[in-house]
């Protein structure tokens, strides 16, 4: 009876979320059959988050809005391990907006979710950031340094990476 009511609730949530994400891929967390953690299909999952590579080319502001419509944000990168996971799904000849910007052009970089900007956990290409008018950050590939961050003009269309917490049903 308990399992039946849990399944009914789960199906109800799946139906409710279908208008935003037609399909979810779920896994059971640990041994407790009660907890399913889900990511939209075909998003990828790493630790407690889901990631989506948006191949449409848009400005930083439009890219962030595109993520938020899906219940996500432009990606906030917290660790080297997270970046190493993300780059597995990126194309070397493309650049992707991060959820990192410097709105005032004063080199006060801020993450979109207000995670404190920590200089010790940044992955700028050497010599970057290098222009006060370039107020948005991308991740791209340079043959000399592999994957790293670069500051660019926010209005220049780029691909982007969305990130959201896993959906628990």
């Amino acid at each position: 009876n308990f399992m039946y009511s849990k399944t009914v609730k789960r199906l109800s949530k799946l139906r409710e979320y279908q208008q935003y994400h037609p399909s979810l891929t779920c896994v059971m967390e640990g041994k407790d059959i009660e907890d399913w953690s889900c990511c939209p299909t075909p998003w990828t999952s790493f630790q407690s988050s889901c990631y989506f590579i948006s191949t449409g080319m848009q400005s930083w502001t439009k890219s962030q809005k595109n993520c938020s419509v899906m219940g996500a944000d432009l990606v906030v990168i917290n660790t080297r391990e997270e970046q190493d996971f993300i780059i597995q799904n990126l194309k070397r000849n493309s650049s992707y907006f991060l959820g990192l910007s410097d709105p005032g052009g004063r080199r006060h970089w801020q993450w979109v979710d207000q995670t404190p900007y920590n200089e010790n956990v940044t992955f700028w290409h050497s010599g970057e950031p290098n222009n006060l008018d370039e107020r948005c950050a991308i991740i791209n590939f340079r043959s000399s340094e592999e994957w790293g961050w670069n500051d660019i003009h926010c209005h220049v269309p780029q691909k982007s990476i969305c990130k959201m917490k896993k959906i628990y049903i």
Epitope: E16, Y17, Q19, Y20, T61, Q64, K65, S68, V69, M70, G71, D73, V112, D113, Q114, M164, K165, I167, Y168
Partner: nanobody, 127 residues
Amino acid sequence: QVQLQESGGGLVQPGGSLRLSCAASGDTFSNYAMGWFRQAPGKAREFVAAISRSAGSTYHVDSVKGRFTISRDNAMNTVYLQMNSLQPEDTAHYYCAARLTFNLIDYYTAETRYTYWGQGTQVTVSS
């Protein structure tokens, strides 16, 4: 898509009260975290208060704490901002904003995280 319409603004004397309402239509209101922002003439838009989709979590900026209260009625598709002890520095255009979330207790304080915005309602505090 969510459409938002604010109401309840007006002219009030210092120390007075107002209750702002923001009526939502379109998508399922209870799937959205909500926020109130304000913009005084010549200033940037600033965050005021936010509420999670379940109403289980709220946050108010320090300058309004103890005076303003955000709340919501999911059955009425409406979010409210009760404003007491109003001061001249509260004079501004007040906007509500909505953002889809799958987490019952998350709220959002950053302007860039909100997707949908109302047109706003003017609040003037003056004697």
